[in-house]
Interface confidence: low
Amino acid sequence: PPGGVVVRDIGDTTIQLSWSRGFDNHSPIAKYTLQARTPPAGKWKQVRTNPANIEGNAETAQVLGLTPWMDYEFRVIASNILGTGEPSGPSSKIRTREAAPSVAPSGLSGGGGAPGELIVNWTPMSREYQNGDGFGYLLSFRRQGSTHWQTARVPGADAQYFVYSNESVRPYTPFEVKIRSYNRRGDGPESLTALVYSAEEEPRVAPTKVWAKGVSSSEMNVTWEPVQQDMNGILLGYEIRYWKAGDKEAAADRVRTAGLDTSARVSGLHPNTKYHVTVRAYNRAGTGPASPSANATTMKPPPRRPPGNISWTFSSSSLSIKWDPVVPFRNESAVTGYKMLYQNDLHLTPTLHLTGKNWIEIPVPEDIGHALVQIRTTGPGGDGIPAEVHIVRNGGTSMMVEN
């Protein structure tokens, strides 16, 4: 193999490599190939050279296309008509000269933070793009529409964000931002301009036309007109606050909608109770002002008595069940129908049946000998107390059972 590989004239992207001819095995050397690697673990790769094709009588060539401020080792491989020889031993390790960065940082983005802040993020540049010592980032930013760029120097290759804090920064304001890197040899090229928003603040506007209505003894529906997206941030949803008439608003419970719904159902309320309700918009920064309050009264509770006097009849493939209607008291809500849960002895889970009458017929397999039935009222106040009975197939006759 060739020997005596020596590096001379080290530049930022080029070096001059010299070597001595090795034994040609009685066949003239036709050409040389130069390879480089970045120690300690880099793989040997062929490099561009000047001249591009190195003839067999050459003992020096220039290596092109190297990265500034990078460690390299080089080796030489000779070829003749018989084939390619063993590579030379590696040259001593050298470091190319420094140069100003040649690539702009990427991943420019940002947003968030506290009121009055503009946060800008980017992807830190790896060692191969730093090109020299004293590396850092130079950030330029201006409010969209402004002509004056402000700049900030952020030292350190690992830096990945910058926070500009100023009381004059209005909430959720778009800023044009660009970035370049620098080292002690100079500044690199600028990135493309990105649009980054300053930190959000709470919404300024309250929802309007808030309307609330009790829909059961423990629930109410709340609807409202949405707020327009204001300049303070991205609207995330609405917060409903509700409290009993006679209580202080400070004692209010609250529920937030996930998304920009304009209605919500609030549950866990007391029956036959008047509530005050307000709605507020919220974003990442917090909650906005309250709407005017609306009122809603929950329904009277469902009857506290289960259906009684339950009887049934089996046919070959169906089961008919009837019961006495439940008549609500004055302080109870109306009965609009009945819910029946049916569970046979083949399954762990019941099926739900609804009827507006005081009887129901359901299909059952012929091999069902007995089943559990649960019947309860349903109505505007919600579901009532269930009656549970164990029924047995008994030659198609009717039977009465106690609850």
């Epitope: 996930a258 998304g259 019941p350």
Partner: antibody
Framework: QVHLVESGGGLLQPGGSLRLSCAAS????????MSWVRQAPGKGLEWVSG????????YYADSVKGRFTISRDNSKNTLYLQMNSLRAEDTAVYYC??????????WGQGTLVTVSS | EIVLTQSPGTLSLSPGERATLSCRAS???????LAWYQQKPGQAPRLLIY???SRATGIPDRFSGSGSGTDFTLTISRLEPEDFAVYYC?????????FGQGTKVEIK
């Protein structure tokens, strides 16, 4: 008997727009919430959007939020899905469904939307 | 969003055998708002179970659902030839509504 028939599918390029319709019959349309669900070729089901009976509230999957709009015309017993800024990943069979106790109780047979350049 | 994970991915059984399909939620499913659907090739899905345990209209009683919170099960007590299909669970308790990735029940 509940009957749902989707229409409006077709082949279009990325960035294009399309409006799907779902004609409903056999039930009191205005009393029921409706939904759109899609299924990419050979893939699972993905809920797209939902709308309450009176049309007052709408809901969207994150993947379509801001691009798709669900609406309904209760006088025509028809559900719509307006799809804008379509992408290749929106290619799917789109089903409309009637909600029963919150679940997707009745489904149409679907309409194929293909987004390809 | 709530992520639903179904297991197993594929279930190889013979007609007459019992099939047990599992659906696990990444967080509690509100009010047991969980449904099961059956889908056969080239067809729209069909609702089997809603409210975690209530069979939909016209669904044979060999299909049953159980569970609450984060763990739900669909059981097919005796597989009929027409039951071999893909089964999906779906939660509708919180937006966005989400589906599991599906369990394929195939003939062994």
């Amino acid at each position: 008997q509940v009957h749902l028939v989707e229409s409006g599918g077709g082949l279009l390029q990325p960035g294009g727009s399309l409006r799907l319709s779902c004609a409903a019959s056999g039930f009191t349309f205005s009393s029921y919430a409706m939904s759109w669900v899609r299924q990419a070729p050979g893939k699972g089901l993905e809920w797209v959007s939902g709308i309450v009976g009176n049309g007052g509230s709408t809901y969207y999957a994150d993947s379509v939020k801001g691009r798709f709009t669900i609406s309904r015309d209760n006088s025509k017993n028809t559900l719509y899905l307006q799809m804008n800024s379509l992408r290749a990943e929106d290619t799917a069979v789109y089903y409309c469904a009637k909600l029963e106790w919150g679940a997707l109780g009745y489904w149409g047979q679907g309409t194929l939307v293909t987004v390809s350049s | 969003e709530i992520v639903l994970t179904q297991s197993p991915g594929t279930l190889s059984l013979s007609p007459g055998e019992r099939a047990t399909l599992s659906c696990r939620a990444s967080q509690s499913v509100s009010s047991s708002y969980l449904a099961w659907y059956q889908q056969k090739p080239g067809q729209a899905p069909r609702l089997l179970i809603y409210g975690a345990s209530s069979r939909a209209t016209g669904i044979p009683d060999r299909f049953s659902g159980s569970g609450s919170g984060t763990d739900f099960t669909l059981t097919i007590s005796r597989l009929e030839p027409e039951d071999f299909a893909v089964y999906y669970c779906q939660q509708y308790g919180s937006s966005p509504w989400t589906f599991g990735q599906g369990t394929k029940v195939e003939i062994k």
